[in-house]
């Protein structure tokens, strides 16, 4: 979790006005004080006793797993990928049953040449990883294959992969239109039948940080949200400081409840603080309000 400022007072008043006694704790740091007695009932919210302390489930922490964390770790994948299932018809190679056998000389040579040809076709696409032949069948040689695309995860990864799949379609259409047999001759690496080019299916990695955040937040799902920093998603509650959605509790401590984030206002030697954001100070001696 990201850093929060520790609160050093034990006397807190909720924004509704009632005084609450609470441990003096930086709510981003788990408390590991030993507890004597029946530990099974001490670990709340699904937490379990490991012999020393409560092991809490996300999104809880604390001595008894009674507090809600300000931020939840969500880990988007380093890279995201797309797989395109394509079919092309190669006319410059005669089909034999040996092409069905992936350990045969025929298949190995065809695979090498086809891969070389596709690497040339897709050379300008930064997301392009390679091709993988899944099946070869008669007619001249119908090549069922996957085109593999990969890119670094960013919030816009779907757009990047969608654009890459469009470029793949354009490039394979172009090469299978241009590299064709003329007068029974093919002077290219491979020649194709223009009408045999088809995109069967496209599968794109599905990753939704908002969904992961909501799932991990469990019953607090309505109060946790995703914000980005340096293109990395953070799953935060309004009690996490330093984000657009952060709640400013001024003279108080932010605490999550099942009704959302609320401010627990501090009482100092000189002032009482109140209000939804603990921004209304009342001087104890003069009962003077200032904002």
């Amino acid at each position: 979790p990201l850093a929060t400022i520790p609160v050093s007072t034990t006397s807190l008043t909720s924004s509704e006005g009632s005084t609450i006694s609470t441990p003096s704790v930086d709510i981003s740091t788990p408390v590991t004080t030993s507890i004597v007695g029946d530990q099974c009932s001490r670990c709340k919210n699904g937490g379990f006793w490991d012999g020393l302390k409560c092991q809490c489930l996300t999104p809880y922490y604390g001595e008894s797993c009674e507090e809600v964390v300000n931020s939840i770790d969500i880990a988007p994948p380093e890279t995201v990928s797309a797989q395109m299932e394509l079919t092309v018809t190669v006319t410059s190679v005669k089909f034999t049953d040996e092409l069905k056998n992936h350990s045969s000389q025929e298949f190995r040579e065809f695979n090498k040449t086809f891969t070389e040809q596709m690497n040339i076709v897709y050379s300008g696409i930064p997301e392009y990883v390679g091709v993988n032949i899944t099946n070869l069948r008669l007619g001249s040689v119908v090549v069922e294959h996957d085109v593999l695309l990969r890119t670094k995860y960013t919030p816009e990864y779907k757009t990047a992969l969608d654009n890459a799949t469009e470029v793949v379609k354009q490039k394979i259409t172009k090469v299978t239109t241009e590299q064709i047999m003329t007068n029974d001759n093919c002077s290219a690496l491979m020649c194709f039948n223009t009408t045999g080019t088809q995109v069967q299916n496209i599968t794109v990695t599905q990753y939704d940080p908002v969904e992961e955040c909501r799932q991990k937040a469990e019953e607090y799902e309505d109060y946790f949200l995703v914000e980005y920093r340096d293109q990395k998603p953070y799953c935060i509650s309004p009690c996490e400081s330093g984000f657009n959605a952060s709640k400013n509790c001024n003279h108080g401590k932010c605490q999550m409840s099942q009704n959302g984030a609320r401010c627990l206002c501090v009482t100092t030697e000189t002032h009482w603080y109140s209000g939804e954001d603990c921004n209304q100070g009342t001087q104890k001696s003069h009962h003077h309000h200032h904002h």
């Epitope: 410059s92 001759n185 690496l189």
Partner: nanobody
Framework: EVQLVESGGGLVQPGRSLRLSCAAS???????MGWFRQAPGKEREGVAG???????GYADSVKGRFTISRDNAKNSLYLQMNSLRAEDTALYSC???????????????????RGQGTMVTVSS
């Protein structure tokens, strides 16, 4: 994997003949075969090609002077070069296509196996 080894190169006078041979380590029956050459400081160019069924193709610069042939039983390819000229000086290498390659009725540039080559120098 097919290994190709060329032989028959050497120094020859203009107007004379030379026969190049290429021995393949594996079956060439179902392959298109071809001869390429690369003159010093120049790009490699196709000289002659022959399909599985014996149909041949030649570069314009050698038509009528060079003849390509194959002996599938011996897994060998040949290039008969007549009326040699100074501009024929080059490193000559033979090449084999993938198995079952079709459509190489003229010069094809789709060869996945190539030999190291044999040097032909035409000079008086």
């Amino acid at each position: 994997e097919v290994q190709l080894v060329e032989s028959g190169g050497g120094l020859v006078q203009p107007g004379r003949s030379l026969r190049l041979s290429c021995a393949a380590s594996g079956d060439i029956t179902r392959r298109c075969m071809g001869w390429f050459r690369q003159a010093p400081g120049k790009e490699r160019e196709g000289v002659a090609g022959i399909s599985e069924d014996g149909i041949t193709g030649y570069a314009d610069s050698v038509k009528g002077r060079f003849t390509i042939s194959r002996d599938n039983a011996k897994n060998s390819l040949y290039l008969q070069m007549n009326s040699l000229r100074a501009e024929d000086t080059a490193l000559y290498s033979c090449a084999a296509s993938i198995l079952n390659r079709v459509g190489c009725r003229q010069l094809s540039y789709e060869y996945i196996y190539r030999g190291q080559g044999t040097m032909v120098t035409v000079s008086s």
